[in-house]
């Protein structure tokens, strides 16, 4: 038997993936555990093997179908269970009735590219990945730029309160190396959270022309 407190958190990427993390205070050692998803209205069900990510937490991804297929809607509820093997039986360690569109976390934006760069400004674009058509334009973005001698945590956040997949960074220093990241969040969902940050895009501003500031 496993004692201690348990936390079971899952997010839907809005298309065909539910990612889950299960934390358990108390020794599990070599126990095999999995997450089982059982939707209330659909014919499929899915299982993934929980793998350790730290001493007391495990994670797995429920792959519901092809990456861009729409497998759930706002009417669906999915019963999610953590099952751990005890001898020949499976024991339910945690359970939740999961409303996918109340618990959204999209994939990180992809395909970041510099559209145009000058001495003091840089125009950058990106794309969203595996995002449901249900959102239409109801998305927001946060972006940050890493300047030399600073950390990501120190970078000020730029907020785009609409579905705008580009940004024009201003007041940059000429001939300087920067890095840029962006993340996305749907406006829908009580427990919806920001996507992971995108892979950083490195760029360099153009040097100032001689004789000009």
């Amino acid at each position: 038997a496993v004692n201690g407190t348990s936390q079971f958190t899952c997010f839907y990427n809005s298309r065909a993936n539910i990612s889950c993390v299960w934390s358990q205070d108390g020794a599990l050692q070599d126990t095999s555990c999995q997450v089982h998803a059982w939707p209330d209205r659909r014919r499929w069900n899915q299982t993934c093997e929980l793998l350790p990510v730290s001493q007391a937490s495990w994670a797995c991804n429920l792959i519901l179908g092809a990456p861009d297929s729409q497998k759930l809607t706002t009417v669906d509820i999915v019963t999610l269970r953590v099952l751990c093997r005890e001898g020949v039986r499976w024991r339910v360690m945690a359970i939740q009735d999961f409303k996918p569109f109340e618990n959204l976390r999209l994939m990180a934006p992809i395909s970041l590219q510099v559209v145009h760069v000058e001495t003091h400004r840089c125009n950058i674009s990106w794309e969203i990945s595996q995002a449901s058509h249900y959102f239409e334009r109801h998305l927001e973005f946060e972006a940050r730029t890493l300047s030399p001698g600073h950390t990501w945590e120190e970078a000020p956040l730029l907020t785009l309160k609409q579905k705008q997949e580009w940004i024009c960074l201003e007041t940059l220093t000429p001939d300087t190396q920067y890095e840029f990241q962006v993340r996305v969040k749907p406006l829908q969902g009580e427990f919806t959270t920001w996507s992971p940050w995108s892979q950083p895009l490195a760029f360099r501003t153009k040097p100032a022309a001689l004789g000009k500031d």
């Epitope: 297929s69 706002t74 009417v75």
Partner: antibody, heavy 116, light 107 residues
Framework: QVQLVQSGAEVKKPGASVKVSCKAS????????ITWVRQAPGQGLEWMGD????????NYNEKFQGRVTLTVDTSISTAYMELSRLRSDDTVVYYC?????????WGQGTLVTVSS | DIQMTQSPSSLSASVGDRVTITCRAS??????LNWYQQKPGKAPKLLIY???GLHSGVPSRFSGSGSGTDFTLTISSLQPEDFATYYC?????????FGQGTKLEIK
């Protein structure tokens, strides 16, 4: 095998209420939504609402303006659809169905006639 | 509400014919589209779920395709028992809605 058996035909007066039952067998009643659909003679299908027997959660078609109430009795694996303030255009066949990626099993239908 | 429009409303065909019925949704419903067959005096029967999934016991001459707003039910070779009325239905969002039906008659 999965079966949904509905109660028999009813004749009601305008303004009255009717309660149609739907007894399920052959599967775990609490694990699937039960939906209600109606059909006027020679007409198409119209969704009224659904209920999840495991929790009692319901969804209703706003068209019925609070006239419809869906309930279940899990002890006898039976779902109920009550329609109040009956009008002559409620003279239709009422169906219950199990929902599992589409309405995969249906009751035989219950004809309700509203006539003064 | 999502409107579902079927075409044609009625169709005459012969045994052995290949028949196609279309269904258009008023907004994107992804693949959350089901097809039913109904004969006079009987309850509807599920044929196809989630656009192309063949319900158990349904003959393989029935197939479905489409995505987004435009969907198709195809009967590859009509059999005498296929003459009936066919309905599409979306289960993308409440209230669930049906097409108005396509009556398939013997030519």
């Amino acid at each position: 095998q999965v079966q949904l058996v509905q109660s028999g035909a009813e004749v009601k007066k305008p303004g009255a209420s009717v309660k149609v039952s739907c007894k399920a067998s052959g599967y775990t009643f609490t694990s699937h939504w039960i939906t209600w659909v109606r059909q006027a003679p020679g007409q198409g299908l119209e969704w009224m609402g659904d209920i999840y027997p495991g929790s009692g959660n319901t969804n209703y078609n706003e068209k019925f303006q609070g006239r419809v109430t869906l309930t279940v009795d899990t002890s006898i694996s039976t779902a109920y659809m009550e329609l109040s303030r009956l009008r002559s255009d409620d003279t239709v066949v009422y169906y219950c169905a199990r929902e599992r990626g589409g309405f995969d099993y249906w009751g035989q239908g219950t004809l309700v006639t509203v006539s003064s | 509400d999502i409107q579902m429009t079927q075409s044609p409303s009625s169709l005459s065909a012969s045994v052995g014919d290949r028949v196609t019925i279309t269904c258009r949704a008023s907004q994107d419903i992804s693949n959350f589209l089901n097809w039913y067959q109904q004969k006079p005096g009987k309850a509807p029967k599920l044929l196809i779920y989630y656009t192309s999934g063949l319900h158990s016991g349904v003959p393989s001459r029935f197939s479905g395709s489409g995505s987004g707003t435009d969907f198709t039910l195809t009967i590859s070779s009509l059999q005498p028992e296929d003459f009936a009325t066919y309905y599409c239905q979306q289960d993308n969002n409440h209230p669930y809605t049906f097409g108005q039906g396509t009556k398939l008659e013997i030519k």
